[in-house]
Amino acid sequence: MMTGTIETTGNISAEKGGSIILQCHLSSTTAQVTQVNWEQQDQLLAICNADLGWHISPSFKDRVAPGPGLGLTLQSLTVNDTGEYFCIYHTYPDGTYTGRIFLEVLESSVAEHGARFQIP
């Protein structure tokens, strides 16, 4: 039975050219986190694996940095980075937990952070 919840940074916005941290946190479960995938729509950005550490997709290695923790840092943001991002927690024995973050990259310098929210 899956008892955990994923808390994410929710809906966030950031300035073009800047950077942003995408963060998810899995709580309320004792399951082992054996791998975390970060995806943008259907593209795999990065993997953090229990045995192999962090691996960043070569397509994104210049603009994506691992961490902090199991989060992901996006740099040199462009308006094309606007969209949905998913953290996918592969756990044992629970299974897979998924968190969603919506990032909006703004031209202006008025970038506000949305509230945190939970996904069961």
């Epitope: 082992q32 791998q35 995938n37 045995d51 192999l52 592969h90 756990t91």
Partner: antibody, heavy 122, light 107 residues
Amino acid sequence: QVQLVQSGAEVKKPGSSVKVSCKASGGTFSSYAISWVRQAPGQGLEWMGGIIPIFGTANYAQKFQGRVTITADESTSTAYMELSSLRSEDTAVYYCARLHLGSSAYYGMDVWGQGTTVTVSS
Amino acid sequence: DIQMTQSPSSLSASVGDRVTITCRASQSISSYLNWYQQKPGKAPKLLIYAASSLQSGVPSRFSGSGSGTDFTLTISSLQPEDFATYYCQQRYVFPPTFGGGTKVEIK
């Protein structure tokens, strides 16, 4: 079922390099990772590094950083481990092992190659 | 790196004996621990993952327990084919590290 078949034994001179191959059959190469583990004569197991073929990226144990290069060729389902600047202490059996990715990542190294003996001697 | 210490380094036992091998981590690793069996001239074989889950095809006489820093591999009734060296491995902190091994010999 997945099998990993490694290249044959090698005898090398100190200061030279060795490249060991590990060919996978019977599974989807892109759905798992490959680790390399070595074992010196009469000693325990030592993790050297691993690669995720879908990215072609590798991470290494600090002890081997700068001296080991792990690569993978998805078209032939083969992983490679190259160790340079060989010294006598590198005499060992070198194993490749499969690591699951994604929802089966909890298993650890569940399929191993037969091992490749590398002897470093002048 | 996390240090994994196994004890004893070797033991002698008879067929039918109950055998216990311990593994201690230098810091807490939760239950991110695997056990492997290796016979002379052969590759290691995964026995137990996640500290206590039995790998498919492994006889039920093998069991694992523990969490945090202290772990145990138990063979409830030693069989002739169990004489081998056993290794624990942590996968909580990169890089993965192995214990020094415990050789189980025939008494």
